[in-house]
Every structure is written in C-alpha cells, then in structure tokens.
Amino acid sequence: SAHAHPRDSCPLGPGRCCHLETVQATLEDLGWSDWVLSPRQLQLSMCVGECPHLYRSANTHAQIKARLHGLQPDKVPAPCCVPSSYTPVVLMHRTDSGVSLQTYDDLVARGCHCA
Amino acid sequence: SAHAHPRDSCPLGPGRCCHLETVQATLEDLGWSDWVLSPRQLQLSMCVGECPHLYRSANTHAQIKARLHGLQPDKVPAPCCVPSSYTPVVLMHRTDSGVSLQTYDDLVARGCHCA
C-alpha cells in the first residue's frame, strides 16, 4: 500500500512534535473588539511543533513530502503541523440589526497532523 | 464576518509565496520500486513557499494564526503552505493476487493554501 505507517511517538522528545496547544487571545489581540461582544477572551487551540519523518502523516502526499524532503531538503519542504479537524465555537457579535449568535466551524483546532 | 480578505498577491516577490510546484520523483526516490510498476516516474505537484500575513488563508483559523504569530512569534507559528485539494492518480501495483490499477486520491496536490 502507498501508506507507510505514520509514527505516533515523537523522536525529538516530549512536546517537540506536532500537537495541539492552547493559546489565550483577547478580542483586541484578534482585532475583533469592534464586532464581537462575547467571549471577551478566547481559548484558541492551535497546532504547533515539528513534523519529523512520518510523524502523524496526514495522508500519502505527506508521506511522499517527508521522504522527498529527506532527499531534496532545499527543494521540498518538510511537512508542517496543521489542523486535521476543528471544534465549532459560538460568538456573540454585532450585526446591522442588533446582536446575534453565530457558529464558526473553522476557528478552533481540535486535532493536528503533518501535511 | 470573521473572514478578513485573504491576499492573493505575494508581497515577498515572484515565486516566494505559497504555490504549487512540480517535483520529479522516481519509484526509487519514493521507496516504491518493490510494489509499484507504473508509472516509473511521477510528476508530483507539491505546495511550497512562504505564507506572509493573510496570504491565501485557508480559513478563519489560519487568519487568527497569522495575526497571533505577528503578536507572539515564539509561541504561535506562521501559517504554512499545504494542499487545499488533490488530483487523483492511478498506480499499477503489485498485490497478492497479481497486479492491479488503484486510484489514489491524496497523492498529488492540485491547489495550495496557507493553514
């Protein structure tokens, strides 16, 4: 099969490889204070860390990328840590007609992989 | 809306920002010569280049990431250039019962964005 087994143990040491991390951000940090009312502070899960060879490969393409990066590091970048899924979050925001609740499906990461 | 307008013009100069690039790879390069018969060489489209602020943002999360990277570059990584879609490709490969054609949907990138 085209799929080599993606690795799940980090060869670089604890916390160094691609993982989910919580980042606190205020509405001011995000530049949203003029149109979002709540929450005033968001707990944003983001994907951080390195992607060593075959660690949490997103798919066949990522495995190829990892291999070719080993062969041609100047030409092919290493895979990088990006969201594999998202957690929906509700924001209370201003509209022309008042305020409303709106769900954002692509705002907070729920899982990460190397793509 | 949570979506600021993603930029499509590269502020870093031609060819520096996230884009699709073709990489030639042999079956030997990929470590596939023992199980894939054809094609003997693949034209692999891969996503390469940098992701400056709001360039080809994949979604709201990527826009937040770009903003927070500007505020906390040591804690929040910049968005990175990954496939937004794939082109299916067929491989002739060995199986226990002979050789057969199999389509891989996630092998060759067709478009790129910053995630």
Epitope: - | L37, S38, T87, P88, V89, V90, L91, M92, L101, T103
Partner: antibody, heavy 118, light 107 residues
Framework: QVTLKESGPGILQPSQTLSLTCSFS??????????VSWIRQPSGKGLEWLAH???????RYNPSLKSRLTISKDTSSNRVFLKITSVDTADTATYYC??????????WGQGTTLTVSS | DIVMTQSQKFMSTSVGDRVSVTCKAS??????VAWYQQKPGQSPKGLIY???YRYSGVPDRFTGSGSGTDFTLTINNVQSEDLAEYFC?????????FGGGTKLEIK
C-alpha cells in the same frame, strides 16, 4: 465496477464518416494516468490499435490512419468519441474501446460492429 | 512500427497439459509487453502486464516471461475454459501493436 460500452451506426456506405461513442462508468478520465483507446478487429482477424486519449487530453493516433481519425472526450459525461472519415469496406470490423492505466488495456467494452457496404 | 509476430496461428493441447505461446518483437521493447485472452464471441481480457506480471484475478496457471524481443505466455494445467485466442501487445512505443494471435484448441 468499471464498464465501457460502444455505440455506433452499425451500417455505413463508402465515403461516409463513422462516429463512435464510448460511454463508461466506474472511473474518471480526470484521474492522472487514465486513458481510453479505440481498437478494432475485422471478423476472424487480429486486433488493430487506432487511437488513444489521455486524462490530460494528449492524443495519439495510428500513423497508418492518422489523417482519417479524430479522438476526443467529454470528461464530465464520461464519454470518449472517435470519428473516422471516408470509410471503406476495409473498415468493416468490430470496434472496441478499452480503458488503460499506464498502457495496459484492463477493461474492454463489448464492441460495436460496423459494416461498410454500398 | 514495431511488428509483433506470433508464428503459431493454432496450437492444439489437452486438458491438464502445459502449453507455451510465443511472441517475437521486431525490435527491443524491454518488458513493455502485455498478453490478452479472447474467448469466442467475447471481447479481449487482460492477462499479463509488463511481460511477467499476472493481472489481478487471473489464475496462477498463466505465467508470462521474456524481455527484449522474445516473449512467452505459458499455461500450466490447461483447462477447457482456456479455449481462446491469445494476443501479445507491445506498449513500448506508438503505435501500440498486437501480434496476429494464437488460437488454442483443446483436443
């Protein structure tokens, strides 16, 4: 499940143009590596390859017939077409379309028979 | 054009026997040769790819061999359902060309 089915006029008179259609399912001609060929077989004789169209619209023809052949595709409707101009009695044959992945004809249609007669 | 020659138009064999169908290319085609089986009244069916690789689902009594200019399709333990015509084909260069076919008759 991959299937291909040829359709054509059945009978033509000499000098007319033959239009063949290959309707297929179970694969896409937008997949890199895929192609469809037309092959013919006069009754009781061998196989003659006529033309090939690749996923990227690259086309190849048998040089002995090239001036008379036109192959084309409609990827969205899963059809491949072949036109042969100025048919003659020598074009009487069963016409097959076949799927290829990297040059191997792994699935064939049932064939459509053409008789050229005045 | 590359000419593929199957010198034996007919071969006669018995159930349980082993038979070898040969094919000669007019120039070197590497291993870019396929074999097809056509039963009476049916369309051809792929048997062998790249000279020696059996296509998925093809019984293992069918084996292909050869490279360069000389190729062989061997059928071990011939069965009555193997009554068919066998064609070789080169895909080393355009135009693709087929051999003239070898009809296998079961005694």
């Amino acid at each position: 499940q991959v299937t291909l089915k040829e359709s054509g006029p059945g009978i033509l008179q000499p000098s007319q143009t033959l239009s063949l259609t290959c309707s297929f399912s179970g694969f896409s001609l937008s997949t890199s590596g895929m192609g469809v060929s037309w092959i013919r077989q006069p009754s009781g004789k061998g196989l003659e390859w006529l033309a090939h169209i690749y996923w990227d619209d690259d086309k190849r023809y048998n040089p002995s017939l090239k001036s008379r052949l036109t192959i084309s595709k409609d990827t969205s409707s899963n059809r491949v077409f072949l036109k042969i101009t100025s048919v003659d009695t020598a074009d009487t044959a069963t016409y097959y379309c076949a799927r290829t992945g990297w040059d191997f004809f792994d699935y064939w249609g049932q064939g459509t028979t053409l008789t050229v007669s005045s | 054009d590359i000419v593929m020659t199957q010198s034996q138009k007919f071969m006669s064999t018995s159930v349980g026997d082993r038979v070898s169908v040969t094919c000669k290319a007019s120039q070197n085609v590497g291993t870019n040769v396929a074999w097809y089986q056509q039963k009476p009244g049916q369309s051809p069916k792929g048997l062998i790819y790249s000279a020696s690789y059996r296509y998925s689902g093809v019984p293992d009594r069918f084996t292909g061999s050869g490279s360069g200019t000389d190729f062989t399709l061997t059928i071990n333990n011939v069965q009555s359902e193997d009554l068919a015509e066998y064609f070789c084909q080169q895909y080393n260069s355009y135009p693709y060309t087929f051999g003239g076919g070898t009809k296998l008759e079961i005694k």
